[in-house]
């Protein structure tokens, strides 16, 4: 999906009002400097691409974050403020339902969400170019 035509300010507002709190709650108990920041993004569409990938794509050691509160709110924000986004996700959602696993917070998931916090922080930068 090409995130170029999203309403970035509305997504930013959704992040500041709720998603950020849910990320904080997920990370509760984690040490501030436990994880290095290794994922970056250069503009807002790129940030959303990376956010979508880390939030919804299973990775080794972290089967799924998609049912977490921050992920569901991220999905809702993208569906509302990115034209055509929800249509592209129907097939992906069907596939995810088939392989959903028991929800377990692993260290790898915490590291992944730490990277997500960094990506969201970059997305919110007022001077970050749109494209």
């Amino acid at each position: 999906y090409d995130f170029t035509n999203c309403d970035f300010e509305k997504i930013k507002a959704a992040y500041l009002s709720t998603i950020s709190k849910d990320l904080i709650t997920y990370m509760s108990g984690t040490k501030s400097t436990e994880f290095n920041n290794t994922v970056s993004c250069s503009n807002r569409p790129h940030c959303l691409t990376e956010i979508q990938s880390l939030t919804f794509n299973p990775t080794a050691g972290c089967a799924s974050l998609a049912k977490e509160m921050f992920a569901m709110k991220t999905k809702a924000a993208l569906a509302i403020w990115c034209p055509g986004y929800s249509e592209t996700q129907i097939n992906a959602t069907q596939a995810m339902k088939k392989r959903r696993k028991r929800k377990v917070t692993t260290n790898k998931c915490l590291e992944q969400v730490s990277q997500l916090q960094g990506l969201w922080r970059r997305f919110n930068r007022p001077l970050l170019k749109q494209q």
């Epitope: 904080i24 509760s28 108990g29 040490k31 501030s32 970056s40 970059r122």
Partner: antibody
């Protein structure tokens, strides 16, 4: 181990500028955010702003925009804070402090005592 | 900005006593609260993060509790070396803010 080294004192005249330093060691400089915190004598702590050494992006407390400018020198793993148009209100201890993506401060410098006096 | 209020500027206690230092946030900060100890002439030191997690090397007589808007740092069996200023800080929302501090005095 992580260390943040700051000079002990700076004495500057009113109206002048000063550049405070914070030399980091014991970790990868670009991995974490560097913050600056102000403490006036006998008072509380006030967050000034943060800089991401990986790309020099800064965020400031609104109260310090135009007063403080944060920079880094990658070659020496040193963070700087320049304070401009100094007045007696700027006399304080200034700390650098370190965080990851979660913004509480596990590591602090020893602080630089800035005195603004003619 | 979120205001962190420490209603007691000073608290007096005796060695061996138990003392509660409180901090109130002006809005919900979940459990994103840290506590710092600052001894005279020193930089602040992290005691507690995530409202109740003890930082490495902090004696277990220091305990944090609370969530939402009300937070407490409890020092049980107070020692003379606990004479210090104690600050709370919220990191739930930008701008990160501190309480004004509570000075613990030993009788």
């Amino acid at each position: 181990q992580v260390q943040l080294l700051q000079p002990g004192t700076e004495l500057v005249k009113p109206g002048a500028s000063v550049k405070l330093s914070c030399k980091a060691s014991g970790y990868t400089f670009t991995s974490y955010l560097m913050h600056w915190v102000k403490q006036r004598p006998g008072q509380g702590l006030e967050w000034i702003g943060e800089i991401d050494p990986s790309d020099s992006y800064t965020d400031y407390n609104q109260n310090f925009r135009g007063k403080a400018t944060l920079t880094v020198d990658m070659s020496s793993s040193t963070a700087y804070m320049q304070l401009s148009s100094l007045t007696s209100e700027d006399s304080a201890v200034y700390y650098c402090a370190l965080t990851g993506t979660i913004n509480y401060f596990d590591y602090w410098g020893q602080g630089t005592t800035l005195t603004v006096s003619s | 900005d979120i205001v962190m209020t420490q209603s007691h500027k000073f608290m007096s206690t005796s060695v061996g006593d138990r003392v509660n230092i409180t901090c109130k946030a002006s809005q919900d900060v979940v459990t994103a609260v840290a506590w710092y100890q600052q001894k005279p002439g020193q930089s602040p030191k992290l005691l507690i993060y995530w409202a109740s997690m003890r930082h490495t090397g902090v004696p277990d007589r220091f305990t944090g509790s609370g969530s939402g808007t009300d937070f407490t740092l409890t020092i049980s069996n107070v020692q003379s070396e606990d004479l210090a200023d104690y600050f709370c800080q919220q990191y739930s929302s930008f701008t990160f803010t501190f309480g004004s501090g509570t000075k613990l005095e030993i009788k």
